[in-house]
Amino acid sequence: TPEVWVQVRMEATELSSFTIRCGFLGSGSISLVTVSWGGPNGAGGTTLAVLHPERGIRQWAPARQARWETQSSISLILEGSGASSPCANTTFCCKFASFPEGSWEACGSLPPSSDPGLSAPPTPAPILRADL
């Protein structure tokens, strides 16, 4: 069964800067990744970035740099200044559209006890399934 994992960490150098990493554990080819915050995309969440494996990457503030880390994982750095900056309990969600599995989404937030710059190893987060 495909899974999506989400890892959130606060940067030690900039305490209001976050890095979100998401990955897809499945055999299908990924056609699109959507990263949002404040809840799942389409359910109150606000889109931060949309990544297509070949067409390119679109991102919006406070996202600073979205990129593919591997063919099945992405990372997103968020700026930490201004009214739209994230806070420690912000929820981040990643939605992977894959063929033939469908669409898979998971959410995560900063671990409550985590020190800046430290985070638990990425583990599969609760998975929401919405077939394409």
Partner: antibody, heavy 114, light 113 residues
Amino acid sequence: EVQLVQSGAEVKKPGSSVKVSCKASGYTFSSFSIEWVRQAPGQGLEWIGEILPGSNSTNYNEKFKGRVTFTADESTSTAYMELSSLRSEDTAVYYCSSYWFAYWGQGTLVTVSS
Amino acid sequence: DIVMTQSPDSLAVSLGERATINCKSSQSLLNSGNQKNYLAWYQQKPGQPPKLLIYGASTRESGVPDRFSGSGSGTDFTLTISSLQAEDVAVYYCQNAHSYPPTFGQGTKLEIK
């Protein structure tokens, strides 16, 4: 079928503003950004910026910051580009586009002349 | 900003012959993580909007004839039309799809010899 339909040609005076509309159909309007690109007569393509209708998040080309405003109305699946303080060199065809420039509107000719 | 430079500025090719357009970017368009090059090619005919031909440097957009092909990596890219048809007369643009702002080449005008 994805379609982007733009408003008609405009003739404007220098110093005035113009608002161009782009009505989308055939896909989920809120999910993908609407890009705006212009092309001066006989010239190449120049990216103005983009708006993501679902959140009204925007990115602007630095060249146009402060002079251009993007808005979107999800209820009608229509995006708008307003360009102010028009000058003669803004005379161009203005295009909207979506899904990484895979789909384009037919273009709107804006002529700035006194 | 990434500067895109096309060559030649204009090109005349006989019907049925091969046409080659080059595009050079001032920075690499390769995403090392997934080894994809974020470069696109467009065709524009007079009075029409641009039409996406190629994305990801080498993937043809749906419905584009297979005589169009894209190649290259990093900073150097090529659009090839294997056998020129009369309807291919147009201006061709390459585009940086790697980073903001998306920037276009100056265009290459393709004509029939």
